[in-house]
């Protein structure tokens, strides 16, 4: 079974990549970053 800790770790892996994709979209669409 996958532990809760592992699930949280896996979720955390992509946070910067999500920020990265959001910021790239922000530069194009000028959506607010907050």
């Amino acid at each position: 079974a996958v532990s809760e800790h592992q699930l949280l770790h896996d979720k955390g892996k992509s946070i910067q990549d999500l920020r990265r994709r959001f910021f790239l979209h922000h530069l194009i669409a000028e959506i607010h970053t907050a």
Epitope: G12, K13, S14, I15, Q16, D17, R19, R20, F22, F23, L24, H25, H26, L27, I28, A29, E30, T33, A34
Partner: antibody, heavy 118, light 115 residues
């Protein structure tokens, strides 16, 4: 094809100002964020400034914040970098770069050399 | 502090495979990075972005001889069947947004020599 052509470089004395331009063609300029990246002679790359598609948002590293200003004129398909209070350490080739939806610096110009010297 | 570390130089034989390494600061080991190629006296060229899981997207005109992979804080650029035109500096970069501020840093670059 995407084309970015920088101009405005030259020799300038410390403390003086200079404005660089980047003429863009081959794509819808007003649809993309743009950046300036510099490279001191024989050294590595350094990000200098980024501006959003419409010019509403600008970003700078601490090394140039308050001295450099990035701007754009979408009607002229041109990106600018106003550089004030220039220092010897600002001597570099300055490149403009265009983002895509996937990455920050997908396309680069050929660069323009700025030399700050007395 | 967001830092990228690269070896300053590497040499490989013509036709061989080259594996170049970019190491993220330990607290940023999950970050997506970018690879750039800079041939002598030319501007940088975007090669690929490379995620923590090893998935990557290559830039326009980049041959499929170029691939990426990841292990922990290390990000690898592998060039197979090395050709003379692959001789260049290979630079990694990484960006992040913190409190509505953008930061982008480059590694020092690895000078690849094809023997």
């Amino acid at each position: 094809q995407v084309q970015l052509v920088e101009s405005g470089g030259g020799v300038v004395q410390p403390g003086r100002s200079l404005r660089l331009s980047c003429a863009a063609s081959g794509f819808t300029f007003s649809s993309y964020g743009m950046s300036w990246v510099r490279q001191a002679p024989g050294k590595g790359l350094e990000w200098v400034a980024t501006i959003s598609s419409g010019g509403s948002y600008t970003y700078y590293p601490d090394s140039v914040k308050g001295r450099f200003t990035i701007s754009r004129d979408n009607s002229k398909n041109t990106l600018y970098l106003q550089m004030n209070s220039l220092r010897a350490e600002d001597t570099a080739v300055y490149y403009c770069a265009r983002q895509t939806t996937m990455t920050y610096f997908a396309y680069w110009g050929q660069g323009t050399l700025v030399t700050v010297s007395s | 502090q967001l830092v990228l570390t690269q070896s300053s130089s590497a040499s490989f034989s013509l036709g061989a495979s080259a594996k170049l390494t970019c190491t993220l600061s330990s607290q940023h080991s999950t970050y997506t990075i970018e690879w750039y190629q800079q041939q002598p006296l030319k501007p940088p060229k975007y090669v690929m972005d490379l995620k923590q899981d090893g998935s990557h997207s290559t830039g326009d005109g980049i041959p499929d001889r170029f691939s990426g992979s990841s292990s922990g804080a290390e990000r690898y650029l592998t060039i197979s069947s090395l050709q003379s035109e692959d001789e260049a500096d290979y630079i990694c970069g990484v960006g992040d947004t913190i409190k509505e501020q953008f930061v982008y840093v480059f590694g020092g670059g690895t000078k690849l020599t094809v023997l």
